[in-house]
């Protein structure tokens, strides 16, 4: 298949990935769908270096990432292993807090104002970050 060799317009390249930073909000699922329709996914943070890069671009604003536990265990949207992977939760998080009065707990992860992670109600309209990897084979058929 063909491969993406450079980032789309308005996306930022970093370490062979492309990132797009929203400036408005959506619920987690709607943000996830937006990224998918752009052949991307909500950002998956795999290192401290990537954490600092994303944090630099989003500033002190609540921002969704591609991590959730809506089906039980915490999972990254691209299949990256959560248990063995990078984590940057705030102290005492995630806590699946039910006290917000919105029904249910907290199943979606976001960057907080200091960059550390918190779990929150997935319906909150936060900003989000999409990520897609360069050199990743697309699903187009090969040109003959």
């Amino acid at each position: 298949g063909s491969e993406r060799t450079c980032c789309p317009v308005n996306w930022v390249e970093h370490e062979r990935s492309c990132y797009w930073f929203s400036r408005s909000g959506k619920a987690w699922a709607d943000a996830d769908n937006y990224c998918r329709l752009e052949d991307a996914h909500l950002v998956v943070v795999t290192s401290w270096e990537e954490q600092k890069f994303v944090q630099h671009h989003i500033g002190p604003v609540n921002t969704w990432m591609g991590l959730h536990d809506q089906n039980g265990p915490w999972k990254w949207v691209d299949g990256t292993d959560y248990e063995t992977g990078f984590k940057n939760w705030r102290p005492e998080q995630p806590d699946d807090w039910y006290g917000h009065g919105l029904g249910g707990g907290e199943d979606c992860a976001h960057f907080t104002d200091d960059g550390r992670w918190n779990d929150d109600v997935c319906q909150r309209p936060y900003r989000w970050v999409c990520e897609t990897e360069l050199d990743k084979a697309s699903q187009e058929p090969p040109l003959l």
């Epitope: 789309p8 408005s24 959506k26 619920a27 769908n33 937006y34 329709l37 052949d39 187009e140």
Partner: antibody
């Protein structure tokens, strides 16, 4: 100049199938999500389906889920809609449209002229 | 699903008039709203996206505003070519949904 040209419409019996095509030119087809939107005679606009630039992600309206399949061939710059188990309520003009990403949402910036699908016995 | 409603369903106006069309969403759509114009027998045309951004080539007499669930399309001085049907559309959530349309015709 961007052009989208639909074809494949016609008269089909209830329960039948039809495949619509949309030939695109004038832009980098593989870089854009593409969508189908329909309009029943004398009625408003009804979103049907959308597909990402690579074809890797698809979304459907509940009314067509499981019956319609959106696909694309980027080597031919062509979008498709396979319609099975057609019903009278699927009768409409079917438009293909490019779905531009603007600030965090997708909007339909270029449209074809439409192709009429009539489901009747 | 998010339901979109429009009012009025039709409006009669004269050239030069200021015309206002409102669109209401059944829940907050976070500003992800577009407006389209459609003339009889033709495909729709994108006028405005993300509430107030004017699509390239669209005259400045068209403007959009609003937030939350309530939005407005304004034509500041109606021109002969503006007689058409106008639709709002939300892109906040799948399924994308359109309003039922507002027909602007000649008084």
């Amino acid at each position: 100049e961007v052009q989208l040209l639909e074809s494949g419409g016609g008269l089909v019996q209830p329960g039948g199938s039809l495949r619509l095509s949309c030939a695109a030119s004038g832009f980098t087809f593989s870089s854009y999500a593409m969508s189908w939107v329909r309009q029943a005679p004398g009625k408003g606009l009804d979103w049907v389906s959308v597909i990402s630039g690579s074809g890797g992600s698809t979304f459907y309206a509940d009314s067509v889920k499981g019956r319609f399949t959106i696909s694309r061939d980027n080597s031919k710059s062509t979008l498709y809609l396979q319609m099975n188990s057609l019903r009278a309520e699927d009768t409409a003009v079917y438009y293909c449209a490019s779905a531009i990403a603007a600030a965090g949402a997708h909007y339909f910036d270029y449209w074809g002229q439409g192709t009429l699908v009539t489901v009747s016995s | 699903d998010i339901q979109m409603t429009q009012s009025p369903s039709s409006v009669s106006a004269s050239v030069g008039d200021r015309v206002t069309i409102t669109c209401r969403a059944s829940r907050d759509i976070n500003g992800w709203l577009a407006w389209y114009q459609q003339k009889p027998g033709k495909a729709p045309k994108l006028l405005i996206y993300t509430v107030s951004s004017l699509q390239s080539g669209v005259p400045s007499r068209f403007s959009g505003s609003g937030s939350g669930t309530d939005f407005t399309l304004t034509i500041s001085s109606l021109q002969p070519e503006d007689f058409a049907t106008y639709y709002c559309q939300q892109s906040n959530s799948f399924p994308f949904t359109f309003g039922p349309g507002t027909k602007v015709d000649i008084k």
